[in-house]
Interface confidence: low
């Protein structure tokens, strides 16, 4: 949904977002192919490829924000996830390069769409606030206030480590995106229910 | 700082047992390879298996199979070769390394000389 | 298994003038899925176990001075160190890991003329 064209009814709000946040929580639309367009597909990389302690917050720390500060966390922290993204995506192989080295398209077409879904999640983050009438809440194109940001990588030394980063920052994202999830999911019928 | 320390030379005679030892230090044992490699006297590299610490996940040359056991003991960091029946043809330099899987070796130890011998 | 070939066996170089080392594998360690050439170098000096030099055939491993470069793809390597040190003088390996087992050259010394 466009800016402005917000649902009033909070169990449709909610459902997208829990819908949303369901298919960003899953590896194969952005961790896996990332790792196939990268190479980094070698027996057991999935090991060097945990997230860094402290890169997004935890379950724990997103529970005890009550919704409001929720939102603005979850908005802030994605608006950084987008910038990160921005700059994976300079460092990925074009199209053309792909087909000639027989790497599947489909992989490079699912990258390019996760800023696409998170900017439709933040939208739909937006009209969840105006719902809660949480003015503090920032719009869709902004960073919100208060929260902590993913930590700026550890300058590489080689272009692998820099790949092997990339990887961290999207397996803590999709770490992330599963916690923010669980705390939807237990969200009440109601804008008004366990509002602090 | 990475490091992979092996144990000392050893002198056996032929159909002896061995048990040779890596201890690694200074990273997460359990989220990397631990890769085996011979090398004999004035000869080249070659590579006899690698063990996943974590879960004792282990790969071997067909070379190797059933000629060597690779063994690891996470709680103390350490990875093993061993011979339950050596050969004279066992004589070499035997290194232990890193690896991201199945694949480069990052880290070596400083390589322990076995000789055989009666 | 892969069969690594290096070429020269050995090679002397003047001090400052370039080395340059074959590799040839049997069959092509570029794999279509992620085009990365699964291979590297090692070099190894008397007495010393081998050291990374080289992975995913030309990005160099941290604190590898930038005179040793690695290129080609497919079948077909080379190990360049564009000005020869004294402190060169090793025997130098090309090690495929495409498939197991893992496979290594035969090495090429390398020596100062």
């Known amino acids: 949904a466009a800016i402005g064209s917000c649902s009033k009814e909070y169990r449709v709000l909610l459902g997208q977002l829990q819908k949303q946040t369901d298919l960003m929580q899953d590896t194969s639309r952005l961790l896996d192919p990332y790792i196939r367009i990268q190479g980094l597909d070698v027996p057991k990389l999935r090991e060097h490829c945990r997230e860094r302690p402290g890169a997004f917050p935890s379950e724990e720390t997103l529970r005890g924000l009550g919704r409001r500060g929720f939102l603005q966390t979850l908005n802030a922290t994605l608006g950084c996830v987008l910038h990160r993204l921005a700059d994976l995506e300079q460092r990925l192989p074009k199209a053309q390069d792909l087909e000639r080295s027989g790497l599947n398209i489909e992989d490079l077409e699912k990258l390019q769409m996760a800023r696409p879904n998170i900017l439709g999640l933040r939208n739909n983050i937006y009209c969840m606030a105006q719902l809660l009438d949480n003015s503090d809440t920032a719009e869709p194109t902004k960073a919100g206030r208060g929260a902590s940001q993913p930590p700026t990588p550890t300058p590489a030394s080689d272009a692998f480590q820099r790949k092997l980063e990339g990887c961290r920052f999207l397996h803590g994202y999709h770490r992330f995106m599963h916690s923010v999830g669980r705390v939807f999911s237990k969200w009440g019928e109601s804008p008004n229910r366990s509002r602090r | 700082e990475v490091q992979l320390v092996q144990s000392g030379a050893e002198v056996k005679k032929p159909g002896e047992s061995l048990k040779i030892s890596c201890k690694g230090s200074?990273?997460?044992?359990?989220?990397?390879?631990i890769g085996w490699v011979r090398q004999m006297p004035g000869k080249g590299l070659e590579w006899m298996g690698i063990?996943?610490?974590?879960?004792?996940?282990?790969r071997y040359s067909p070379s190797f199979q059933g000629q060597v056991t690779i063994s690891a003991d996470k709680s103390i960091s350490t990875a093993y070769l061993q011979w339950s029946s050596l050969k004279a043809s066992d004589t070499a330099m035997y290194y232990c390394?890193?690896?991201?899987?199945?694949?480069?070796?990052?880290?070596w130890g400083q390589g322990t000389l076995v000789t055989v011998s009666s | 298994d892969i069969v690594m070939t290096q070429s020269p066996d050995s090679l002397a170089v003047s001090l400052g003038e370039r080395a340059t080392i074959n590799c040839k594998s049997s069959?092509?360690?570029?794999?279509?899925?992620?085009?990365?050439?699964?291979l590297a170098w090692y070099q190894q000096k008397p007495g010393q176990p081998p050291k990374l030099l080289i992975y995913?055939?030309?990005t160099r491993e941290s604190g590898v001075p930038d005179r040793f470069s690695g290129s080609g793809s497919g079948t077909d390597f080379t190990l360049t160190i564009s000005s020869l040190q004294a402190e060169d003088v090793a025997v130098y390996y090309c090690?495929?890991?495409?498939?197991?087992?893992?496979?290594f050259g035969q090495g090429t010394k390398v020596e100062i003329k």
């Open positions: 390394a890193r690896g991201f899987g199945a694949s480069y070796l990052d880290y």
């Open positions: 200074g990273y997460s044992f359990t989220s990397y390879w």
């Open positions: 063990i996943y610490p974590g879960d004792s996940d282990t």
């Open positions: 069959q092509s360690v570029l794999a279509s899925s992620n085009n990365n050439n699964f």
């Open positions: 995913w055939a030309s």
């Open positions: 090690q495929q890991y495409y498939s197991t087992p893992l496979t």
